[in-house]
């Protein structure tokens, strides 16, 4: 089942997806698509990287983290209700059926009439470190047989990191969106 992420209309949505490159700059092609992950690639591709750079993107979709270090989390700018749905992050690790795929569910809520800007600024300042810390919260590490020098650390679940904290409830209740950058 997909992990659920929330954002408000007009805010930026953040969908986390990470991997650990075998060596700095030794990148793996990644695609993001709207819709559940199919057998190959991503359906309805919104962004794609190769071993060097982002080589395809559509407006409002970008990687705000350091994708050269394996942070391929997707930011969707200025979301609308139409952005709700399942998104696929696929990490195309070379080899036979090695690629990893993650389905993330984005729920867009109507904007609050009176947002709490002070609190939101605090969250924005507090979370970038936490979001990009590989050792934070439960993580599942899988060593891939045909590519033993790549450890894929799935921290595609920001919700898991936050679920047990009061901050998570705070975020959910206030409807604030975590914005990176």
């Amino acid at each position: 089942s997909e992990v659920e992420y929330r954002a408000e209309v007009g805010q930026n949505a953040y969908l986390p997806c990470f991997y650990t490159p075998a060596a700095p700059g030794n990148l793996v092609p990644v695609c993001w698509g709207k819709g559940a992950c199919p057998v190959f690639e991503c359906g309805n591709v919104v962004l794609r990287t190769d071993e060097r750079d982002v080589n395809y993107w559509t407006s409002r979709y970008w990687l705000n983290g350091d994708f050269r270090k394996g942070d391929v989390s997707l930011t969707i700018e200025n979301v609308t209700l139409a952005d709700s749905g399942i998104y696929c992050c696929r990490i195309q690790i070379p080899g036979i059926m090695n690629d990893e795929k993650f389905n993330l569910k984005l729920v867009i809520k109507p904007a609050k009439v009176t947002p709490a800007p002070t609190r939101q600024r605090d969250f924005t300042a507090a979370f970038p470190r936490m979001l990009t810390t590989r050792g934070h919260g439960p993580a599942e590490t899988q060593t891939l047989g045909s590519l033993p020098d790549i450890n894929l650390t799935q921290i595609s679940t920001l919700a898991n990191e936050l679920r047990d904290s009061r901050l998570a409830n705070d975020l959910r209740d206030s409807g604030a969106t975590i914005r990176i950058g």
């Epitope: 190959f40 195309q92 690790i93």
Partner: antibody, heavy 125, light 108 residues
């Protein structure tokens, strides 16, 4: 104009080997995943292998095989030569078919959108 | 693996008649990844309908596709001679991708 041209088919004895090629033109080959699909005489279509695109080097691809050919067939590509390959070993009579290469279009329709004309493989003693 | 069953296996239709071909999946398929291909004798398959209901480039508007879950269909609103061909459905929602056995559509 997008074109895919298969070659390398022929008559081979059971247990033998054959290497199929598919030369493409009209699009940036390295950007696209590619499939091999076969069709036995008077039968339906049977997907057999896929190799991803979007990689700078041909060796950085993700590969998928159908269980029926796993361990016997090897899909590969040479991006510099715009060519897709299918190395077939330990061939069996049930591998007799027309073999098609097809492009996987992730940009628009995101599926097997263009197919070659096919190359015929007959496995018989 | 998901088995796609197409029915009927063979059918004949008179010009001007409405034709419906069905594709039934053994388990649920995402509608985004259900496709139809047309193939004429001696030719390679052509992409005909993608993502359940979208017509590929050059496909006449008399064709339509619909469905969800395990039940999908291709409809021709008014049969024409050039529509005589075999039609195959494909799913690539789940590994391995699978094709239906095909429906051979003939003109009466």
């Amino acid at each position: 104009e997008v074109q895919l041209v298969e070659s390398g088919g022929g008559l081979v004895r059971p247990g033998g080997s054959l290497k199929l090629s598919c030369v493409v033109s009209g699009f940036t080959f390295s950007d696209y995943g590619m499939h091999w699909v076969r069709q036995a005489p008077e039968k339906g279509l049977d997907w057999i292998a896929y190799i991803s695109g979007g990689s700078i080097s041909s060796g950085s691809s993700t590969i998928y095989y159908a269980d029926t050919v796993k361990g016997r067939f090897t899909i590969s590509r040479d991006n510099a030569k715009n060519t897709l390959f299918l190395q077939m070993t330990s061939l069996r009579s049930e591998d007799t078919a027309m073999y098609y290469c097809a492009r996987h279009d992730w940009r628009g329709l995101y599926a097997m959108d263009y197919w070659g004309q096919g190359t015929s493989v007959t496995v018989s003693s | 693996q998901i088995v796609l069953t197409q029915s009927p296996a063979i059918m004949s239709a008179s010009p001007g008649k409405k034709v419906t071909l069905t594709c039934s999946a053994s388990s649920s398929v995402s509608s985004s990844y259900l496709y139809w291909y047309q193939q004429k004798p001696g030719s390679s398959p052509k992409l005909w309908i993608y993502s359940t209901s979208n017509l590929a480039s050059g496909v006449p508007a008399r064709f339509s596709g619909s469905g969800s879950g395990t039940s999908y269909s291709l409809t021709i609103s008014s049969m024409e001679a050039e529509d005589a061909a075999s039609y195959f459905c494909l799913q690539w929602s789940s590994y391995p991708p699978t094709f239906g056995g095909g429906t051979k559509l003939e003109i009466k």
